[in-house]
């Protein structure tokens, strides 16, 4: 809901609901937070009949699930809302879906957001 700022890290920012939320639609988001916390970037998107619809991108809080991930990759099998997080400036510019399946070999579905 509410935007913050910092000098520690930058992530690609996007908000599909920018008009309703009265935020920018896209840009660079400086991340902020307590000095003892790690910062991450994230991307959230939907796959509507094969069409990728980005929901949000930006900074993410200290999250062990994001540690040491240089690439933004969703590994859950067929979620309704896709989510990935990563470490490194602007690491959420590209995001991918590599479902973790026991039998089937995972396939790469890299996604690069189109400029608005």
């Amino acid at each position: 809901a509410i935007l913050g700022r910092s000098e520690t890290q930058e992530c690609l920012f996007f908000n599909a609901n920018w008009e309703r939320d009265r935020t920018n639609q896209t840009g660079v988001e400086p991340c902020y937070g307590d000095k003892d916390k790690r910062r991450h970037c994230f991307a959230t998107w939907k796959n509507i009949s094969g069409s990728i619809e980005i929901v949000k991108q930006g900074c993410w809080l200290d999250d062990i699930n994001c540690y040491d991930r240089t690439d933004c990759i969703e590994k859950k099998d067929s979620p309704e809302v896709y989510f990935c997080c990563c470490e490194g400036n602007m690491c959420n510019e590209k995001f991918s879906y590599f479902p973790e399946m026991e039998v089937t070999q995972p396939t790469s579905n890299p996604v690069t957001p189109k400029p608005p």
Epitope: G4, N17, K56, L61
Partner: antibody
Framework: EVQLLESGGGLVQPGGSLRLSCAAS????????MNWVRQAPGKGLEWVSG????????SYADSVKGRFTISRDNSKNTLYLQMNSLRAEDTAVYYC?????????????WGQGTLVTVSS | DIQMTQSPSSLSASVGDRVTITCRAS??????LNWYQQKPGKAPKLVIY???SLASGVPSRFSGSGSGTDFTLTISSLQPEDFATYYC?????????FGGGTKVEIK
């Protein structure tokens, strides 16, 4: 140590106005979004309003839209909630809370709350 | 608005018990789910954020799990100071919404 201290609550008649304040200390206030959350007596939590780090973006619950205004003064490290046209159902303890990022708003620090009673 | 439904609304447990509270969202919210603890007359306190991450200063007996629509807060071994009301909250979309709360009482 992060501290948030609300003030300005009290008894007000229906249709009246009240201005709540939240004094912040122990962190760089101008780096953080802030929110107001309320809790009616014996009830659960209800988000009321939020504002981003520089006051450029604000958001309101439908129940208070057009009646309440959130604002901040970063030079004074203070958050405000101007409440107009108050109704009995606005009676609650009002908490200010520090926000995380706009998209994953975990409220990591809260004030102790200030009670607003709307009654004739 | 996204509706958050908690269950149970209250439960009785003993010190040392394993306690599980569930929260269901009316639509998928990915991992945008936070948990708060509130004691009578006190402000809420953040316990878990982003569905699974432990907030600063919170004991490791608290854990969160889930993604999408179904989430769980677990207290592995209930301590006397854990008796309180717990709320889930979604931050996927405006307005931010809370569950109705789960009161954990002493058996």
């Amino acid at each position: 140590e992060v501290q948030l201290l609300e003030s300005g609550g009290g008894l007000v008649q229906p249709g009246g106005s009240l201005r709540l304040s939240c004094a912040a200390s122990g962190f760089t206030f101008s780096d953080y979004g802030m929110n107001w959350v309320r809790q009616a007596p014996g009830k659960g939590l209800e988000w009321v309003s939020g504002i981003n780090y520089n006051g450029g973006y604000t958001s309101y619950a439908d129940s208070v839209k057009g009646r309440f205004t959130i604002s901040r003064d970063n030079s004074k490290n203070t958050l405000y909630l101007q409440m107009n046209s108050l109704r009995a159902e606005d009676t609650a303890v009002y908490y200010c809370a520090r926000a995380a990022n706009w998209h994953d708003t975990a409220l990591d620090y809260w004030g102790q709350g200030t009670l607003v009673t709307v009654s004739s | 608005d996204i509706q958050m439904t908690q269950s149970p609304s209250s439960l009785s447990a003993s010190v040392g018990d394993r306690v599980t509270i569930t929260c269901r969202a009316s639509q998928s919210i990915s991992r945008y789910l936070n948990w708060y603890q509130q004691k009578p007359g006190k402000a809420p306190k953040l316990v878990i954020y982003a569905a699974t991450s432990l907030a600063s200063g919170v004991p490791s007996r608290f854990s969160g799990s889930g993604s999408g629509t179904d989430f769980t807060l677990t207290i592995s071994s209930l301590q006397p100071e854990d008796f309180a009301t717990y709320y889930c909250q979604q931050s996927y979309d405006n307005p931010l919404t809370f569950g109705g709360g789960t009161k954990v009482e002493i058996k």
